[in-house]
Amino acid sequence: MMTGTIETTGNISAEKGGSIILQCHLSSTTAQVTQVNWEQQDQLLAICNADLGWHISPSFKDRVAPGPGLGLTLQSLTVNDTGEYFCIYHTYPDGTYTGRIFLEVLESSVAEHGARFQIP
């Protein structure tokens, strides 16, 4: 029986040109994590394997940094990075757990505007 739960950073926003840490945490299970996949929609960003370490997809190599822990840091953000991200935990003996994060990348001026003027 799968008893674990995935905690994620949920819905997050960041400024264009900035960076953001995507994090998921698997808790409430003693299952061994054998691999974590990070995906954006259907595109693989990175794999963190318990025996082989990290593999960053070549197309993301220059602006993805592994960590902290099993998390992933996205750098030099563009508006095209807006969307859904998934952390897929492969565990033994439980099986697969999936977490979802929605990232919105904002134009700098929009982010500043949003911070200064709040709609009541």
Epitope: E7, I21, H25, L26, S27, T30, V33, V36, C48, N49, A50, L52, G53, W54, H55, I56, K61, D62, V64, A65, P66, G67, P68, G69, L70, T73
Partner: antibody
């Protein structure tokens, strides 16, 4: 077999700089963080920073920014740490340790640095 | 920065005793907590990863538990080779940090 082989004991003068190395074998250095940890005699462990040789990303403990510089030569499977403007407080054993997301699972034997005039 | 506080600083036990070492985080770190053992004049050794996950080659008498801010390393029936220092470390956020350590000594 995974091994991290660190360079030998260093004796340096105050104000000098030293560079130590950590030679990795038995795995791909580009798939793991290489962290550096300081341990003063009889004291605890202090994280200095880490480098991810896969794309040269670095993270530093704010306390060691300007003191430590981390580099890696992937073709030689080696990580390096340079310490500058040495003082007595820098006298310690420095460990390199690899991390692939699942804890720091392999450690070097340590490089002892003594700063003395 | 996440501050990790270990207690007690020193634990005096007799071989065969079972002991619990504590590590408390200054903020929630989920289960991103690892335990290390360091014997005198040796490098640290990873004992437990992610609070409770076992490490290949580590005796089964070592176990970990906890989540959030409170974590425990348990040693079931301490053996003479277990005496030394124990450190916790978090990988929840940069900068990584270590606890101050617990010294396990022979009574």
């Amino acid at each position: 077999e995974v091994q991290l082989q660190q360079s030998g004991t260093v004796l340096a003068r105050p104000g000098a700089s030293v560079k130590m190395s950590c030679k990795a074998s038995g795995y791909s250095i580009t798939s793991y963080w290489m962290h550096w940890v300081k341990q003063r005699p009889g004291q605890g462990l202090e994280w200095i920073g880490g480098i991810y040789p896969g794309n040269s990303n670095t993270n530093y403990n704010q306390k060691f920014k300007g003191k430590a510089k981390l580099t890696a030569v992937t073709s030689a499977s080696t990580a390096n740490m340079e310490l500058s403007s040495l003082t007595n407080e820098d006298s310690a054993v420095y460990y390199c340790t690899r991390e692939g997301g699942y804890g720091m699972d392999y450690w070097g034997q340590g490089t002892s640095v003594t700063v003395s005039s | 920065d996440v501050v990790l506080t270990q207690s007690p600083a020193t634990l005096s036990v007799t071989p065969g005793d079972s002991v619990s070492l504590s590590c408390r985080a200054s903020q929630t770190i989920s289960n991103n907590l690892h335990w290390y053992q360091q014997k005198s004049h040796e490098s640290p050794r990873l004992l437990i990863k992610y609070s409770s996950q076992s490490i290949s080659g580590i005796p089964s008498r070592f176990s970990g538990s906890g989540s959030g801010t409170d974590f425990t390393l348990s040693i079931n029936s301490v053996e003479t080779e277990d005496f030394g220092m124990y450190f916790c470390q978090q990988s929840y956020s940069w900068p990584y940090t270590f606890g101050g350590g617990t010294k396990l000594e022979i009574k």
